[in-house]
Each structure stands twice: as C-alpha cells, then as structure tokens.
C-alpha cells in the first residue's frame, strides 16, 4: 500500500542526514542551485532546484523521494514552483537548510 506521509517524510530526513554525514569531498563537486522559500510548495521547489544538478549520484535518491511529495512532474529547467530565483547556494548548504526545515516540520507532526 501507499507509504504514510509521516514515514515518507522520516525517510527523506534520514536520507538527507546520510548525505550530510557521508560528505567528504564537496557535495556534487560544489554545484550551485537556486535557494528556495521553505514554505508552501517547498517540495516541488526543492525538486525543481535539485533536478538541475546532473551526474551527482549522492542526491539521486533525494530527487526520487522529493518527486513523491510533488504532485506534478518536474523536469530540468522548469521553475513553476521556484517563485524567487535570486540566490544560488551550494548543494551542501541547500541540503542542510532543507534538512533542518523538514526536521522542524516532522517534530511538530506536520507531514503534508
């Protein structure tokens, strides 16, 4: 059956933790991505930002997991959910910021 939202969010958090803990060299060779507003539509925005990073196996699972939270199909170069595209940050910082935000949501029991 379908994975409960709480389980899916927990698994996404744990994957982001794995990425952060296992980071040796610069994540995705220091690739830069658009920073996002961690508000409504965050999952699609995060996917739209990260999907533009290619050839980085470390975040492929995260990309797949985020697609499960986003109701529409996302492809590279698509920015419908990225309302503000003014700042680029390293993927490592993006992952760290996303992880913290998701941990807060999870602790408060906000799964959707």
């Amino acid at each position: 059956g379908p994975v409960p939202p709480s389980t899916a969010l927990r698994e996404l958090i744990e994957e982001l933790v794995n990425i952060t803990q296992n980071q040796k060299a610069p994540l995705c060779n220091g690739s830069m991505v658009w920073s996002i507003n961690l508000t409504a539509g965050m999952y699609c925005a995060a996917l739209e930002s990260l999907i533009n990073v290619s050839g980085c196996s470390a975040i492929e699972k995260t990309q797949r997991m985020l697609s499960g939270f986003c109701p529409h199909k996302v492809s590279a170069g698509q920015f419908s959910s990225l309302h503000v595209r003014d700042t680029k940050i390293e993927v490592a910082q993006f992952v760290k910021d996303l992880l913290l935000h998701l941990k807060k949501l999870f602790r408060e029991g906000q799964f959707n």
Epitope: R10, I13, V17, L100, K103, R107, E108, G109
Partner: antibody, heavy 120, light 107 residues
Framework: QVTLKESGPVLVKPTETLTLTCTVS????????VQWIRQPPGKCLEWLGV???????SFNSVLKSRLTISRDTSKSQVVLTMTNMDPVDTATYYC??????????????WGQGTLVTVSS | DIQMTQSPSSLSASVGDRVTITCLAS??????LAWYQQKPGKAPKLLIY???RLQDGVPSRFSGSGSGTDFTLTISSLQPEDFATYYC?????????FGCGTKVEIK
C-alpha cells in the same frame, strides 16, 4: 572542548520572571541547536524548548505561553525566559547541545545545571 | 504527547552482573531513542542515541536495542562506576519526553 554553562538567579519569587543564560564554547550556535531541560528535585526530566541553529525556536506546548528563547551569537549565549514563576517551577535547569546531524533530537553535551528555587 | 515508561524503577545488582533496563514508548518512535546516565548532583550524560549507537567515549559494556515501542539498555558486566540512574528519551516528536528513570543500586 565543548562546554555549556548556565547562569542566573538561584532564588526567584512567585509571579516573577526567570531569566537564565547559557554560555557555550567549543561550537557555534549557527551550527548546533541548543535545548533547555529542567528537573524538579527527585523528579523526571522535562523538555522546555530549543533554539535551532537558524535562530528559530520551538517549545513544549504545555509551557509555550510562558517561555521565550533568544540568542546572541556574538557572545555565544542562549537566553531562556520563563514568566509567572510558581513554586512548582523549582528545579535544576539545564541547557544542552543537540546532536544535530542526526534524524532524532538528543543531547550530547550538557551544562552542569543551575538549581532555581521559587519561594516568597 | 509520547509517554516513555521505564521499568524497573529501581534495581539492586552486584559488580559483574548483567543488567537490563526497558523503556516502552506509548507510540511508534522508530529508532529515535537515546539513553542517559545521571549521578547525584550531576547533569545527565549521553550513553546511546538512535537506539544502539554508542556515544564516543562510552564503554562497550553498554548496548542498546529495540525499535518501534520497545527498547532495552543492557550493561553486560556492571562496574562500580555504573551505579547511577538511567533515563530513556524519545527524539521523534515534540515535546521531547523522558522516562522517569531506573535507579541502579548496589546489592
């Protein structure tokens, strides 16, 4: 070397406001979360709230209306404020560092604690 | 809130004994459980996090197991310095909550 140290009054009167400061060293407040916990004499540990590394805060809903947590990163200090103190708030108050890079929240370093007595 | 229930509340044991403390969560907390040791007048000290991961510097005689709602802390061979009170803590959902402790005393 990671250290945390609580400071503040040892005695407060009922209805007064308690202000405790946690001064940390050996880590940055912008990289780690700082949690507050209390323990009444001979009783269980109770989580109060957290100052997240990004400056956001979360609280125990039971005490949320009475608590504020703030920080001064330049001084490496986190401040807990609790209003309308009552004798039942008599406890040892601890600040602790959160393990942070983990999926769960746990406390890997603790201050020595400060016993606060509420009495008129 | 997630309630954490420890048992026993106290136990008497001898040096060299194998000691087991259990912690029951009122709902599923995955493996988001930590164990602490506290001695009189001191702050708690982290022993184990994520159910079974030993904190740096903690002796290997301490181990943790379990998942979901049932968890166990085991001390394989009790040492004189292990006489203390032990607490479990869930780090799954706010408010973070603790068990009320198991006091390990000398028999």
């Amino acid at each position: 070397q990671v250290t945390l140290k609580e400071s503040g009054p040892v005695l407060v009167k009922p209805t007064e406001t308690l202000t405790l400061t946690c001064t940390v060293s050996g880590f940055s407040l912008t990289n780690y979360h700082v949690q507050w916990i209390r323990q009444p004499p001979g009783k269980c540990l109770e989580w109060l709230g957290v100052m997240w590394s990004d400056g956001d805060t979360s609280f125990n809903s039971v005490l949320k209306s009475r608590l504020t947590i703030s920080r001064d990163t330049s001084k490496s200090q986190v401040v807990l404020t609790m209003t309308n103190m009552d004798p039942v708030d008599t406890a040892t108050y601890y600040c602790a560092r959160d393990g942070t890079i983990a999926a769960m929240d746990y406390f890997d370093y603790w201050g020595q604690g400060t016993l606060v007595t509420v009495s008129s | 809130d997630i309630q954490m229930t420890q048992s026993p509340s106290s136990l008497s044991a001898s040096v060299g004994d194998r000691v087991t403390i259990t912690c029951l969560a009122s709902e599923d907390i995955s493996n988001y459980l930590a164990w602490y040791q506290q001695k009189p007048g001191k702050a708690p000290k982290l022993l184990i996090y994520h159910t079974s991961r030993l904190q740096d510097g903690v002796p290997s005689r301490f181990s943790g197991s379990g998942s979901g709602t049932d968890f166990t802390l085991t001390i394989s061979s009790l040492q004189p310095e292990d006489f203390a009170t032990y607490y479990c803590q869930q780090g799954y959902r706010f408010p973070l909550t603790f068990g009320c402790g198991t006091k390990v005393e000398i028999k």
